[in-house]
Interface confidence: low
Amino acid sequence: TGADTEAVVCVGTACYTAHSGKLSAAEAQNHCNQNGGNLATVKSKEEAQHVQRVLAQLLRREAALTARMSKFWIGLQREKGKCLDPSLPLKGFSWVGGGEDTPYSNWHKELRNSCISKRCVSLLLDLSQPLLPSRLPKWSEGPCGSPGSPGSNIEGFVCKFSFKGMCRPLALGGPGQVTYTTPFQTTSSSLEAVPFASAANVACGEGDKDETQSHYFLCKEKAPDVFDWGSSGPLCVSPKYGCNFNNGGCHQDCFEGGDGSFLCGCRPGFRLLDDLVTCASRNPCSSSPCRGGATCVLGPHGKNYTCRCPQGYQLDSSQLDCVDVDECQDSPCAQECVNTPGGFRCECWVGYEPGGPGEGACQDVDECALGRSPCAQGCTNTDGSFHCSCEEGYVLAGEDGTQCQDVDECVGPGGPLCDSLCFNTQGSFHCGCLPGWVLAPNGVSCTMGPVSLGPPSGPPDEEDKGEKEGSTVPRAATASPTRGPEGTPKATPTTSRPSLSSDAPITSAPLKMLAPSGSPGVWREPSIHHATAASGPQEPAGGDSSVATQNNDGTDGQK
């Protein structure tokens, strides 16, 4: 898979695994998914600390990480076409496993608005700094990578696996080794909590094969929300050690008998559970009977309890669990209402932002405002939207209709605009003539000039303007600049071979510079001639040519 599990931390009802390996975000999510999990969520400071802890484990074992900055995918992504929402903590991103927008965030820097491509979030670790638990990894957003190009600075990813519950680690009362195998295919000999459905292999003894005993246990749900191994009494007990080894494996007190045997006991206010090892409080709230964020409140004399819900929640029919109150039923918002755990929030439709009179009001976003226009040239704000337009000589282009691209008037749908040669420029074009002909004052036609063996004439220089005269040459050829590798115009004109009619006098020298009949050719300037507008990499100089114009507006830009 290209990724190795290096570390695992289990806490609460979830396990986090950290993996090294250069994978795209999609490949990393697939890897987590294969074992029943997702890329990790970081929905609170506490969860950020769990994730940091598993990364700390990984980084301590990962000798190959030499980069100063390291990145690890988490399950926070924003789909293509979904724009940034600066008013939300997650900025319009969402968790891959679903779920509400969460209040915690830890962005590395201000996010740039880009709706064009999918964006993914990674945790950014500065490996030059000690990984203090107080300094939580920052969130960095960027491209999601692809199988061929996962992102050179992505070092790995973090998965999260959620469970109904956890078992306590098995307690050994004597020498031995426990190996846990989790449902997500990780083996470990030290887990603070062991997920439901994990297997535990216990090998007792100090390594001598003859003395080794093996036990096998499964973490099962013994009763609703009660998980244990089904073992009774400490494991691997030895009269040689009594209570001296790991407190006999007892949770609280260990009592030795005279014969080397021992029993586990509990302190006042606690009782011994069925495993004969673990102690639980006699306080009815200590077993955490209340769920879903409900608080357990002791009744008089500590005999019974009631569950109490936080604001925005109410008790369900079981009187143990809190369920969210749907405040959106009262329509408190002007446009969209999103019910959230314990509350609600008002959202505005795309193209609107919070503002205006009253709670939850929305006002139009002026996308064309100074400094925020998404358009390359013209921008027109509309109610809830905007559209881009382009100056004369340009058309709308780009994936989202916000860019402007030069119109090549020399290959326009209406046919050649010039009588002879045509030079495309950014936003415009110029006409030129074949050798021996000069541009007429109208900037389009060519008139007979003094005989010359030079290259095709470009637009007239400033001092030549309006001085050419003679009979006009019939419309014979169009020439447009060839394009460089990045689409930049080269000024060398291209042309089709002109029809050699009797009234189109073309000398033999330029004919040698034309391509074979029917195929486009490139004018190449003989080196002995002075540079004209048609030479070198620069664009033709501006003459008095008439400009074919095209007005391009009315195409909606993407929000």
Epitope: E46, Q49, R53, A56, Q57, R60, N106, Q129, P130, L132, P133, S134, R135, L136, S190, E192
Partner: antibody, heavy 120, light 111 residues
């Protein structure tokens, strides 16, 4: 109640090593970091290093790196600090102290201290 | 390393009077809105005892005549009404960066 009990005073010659122990009780040993701090007679406090007993991850003050080794034995809930290549300026009281796992690692419980004397 | 500088080195205050100790860090010890600064009290022959954590939080069991304030680089420990049992050396400590460092200590005596 929560307590940290340290081993007794030690006397060593320059160049030798010393290993001080700190036995924890009254709390889950693997749920807190264990730190070592030293204090020269009549002087201030100096952080030596720390260990996460659940996985034996250690961080050291660079000043001591290479000379100090901090270990932990989960089965006996005991942390150890070994200092090698002793010099006379290592004559100090060495304290173990626990800290919370996350966030601000303040030292809420301290051992009684172990005096280490380095003398020829 | 972050250097912690305490002032004054020693302080003599009458019983029932206010005592103020300052601690200055060579760089900010704040992170994500919290100040990673703690105060300890040490009496002769005893280990240090935590008084205040995160600049202003009183450790449980510590009398409320002790209080802490400050952020960034400048912090203060105040004993509002000095008692005889408060005679000790007081240390500030930063836990924002490795190595964790302590101030040089301030000795508080009764005038």
């Amino acid at each position: 109640q929560v307590q940290l009990v340290q081993s007794g005073a030690e006397v060593r010659k320059p160049g030798a090593s010393v290993k001080v122990s700190c036995k924890a009780s009254g709390y889950t040993f693997t749920s807190y970091w264990m730190h070592w701090v030293r204090q020269a007679p009549g002087q201030g406090l100096e952080w030596v290093g720390e260990i996460d007993p659940s996985a034996s991850y250690t961080y050291y003050n660079q000043k001591f790196k290479g000379r100090v080794t901090i270990t932990a034995d989960k089965s006996t809930s005991t942390a150890y600090m070994e200092l090698s290549s002793l010099r006379s300026e290592d004559t100090d009281v060495y304290y173990c102290a626990r800290s919370v796992y996350y966030g601000n690692k303040y030292f809420d419980v301290w051992g009684q201290g172990t005096t280490v004397t380095v003398s020829s | 390393d972050i250097v912690m500088t305490q002032s004054p080195d020693s302080l003599a205050v009458s019983l029932g009077e206010r005592a103020t100790i300052n601690c200055k860090a060579s760089q900010s010890v704040d992170y994500a809105g919290d100040s990673y600064l703690n105060w300890y009290q040490q009496k002769p022959g005893q280990p240090p005892k935590l008084l205040i954590y995160a600049a202003s939080n009183l450790e449980s069991g510590v009398p409320d005549r002790f209080s802490g304030s400050g952020s960034g680089t400048d912090f203060t420990l105040t004993i509002s009404s000095l008692q005889a049992e408060d005679v000790a050396v007081y240390y500030c400590q930063q836990t924002n960066e490795d190595p964790r460092t302590f101030g040089g200590g301030t000795k508080v005596e009764i005038k």
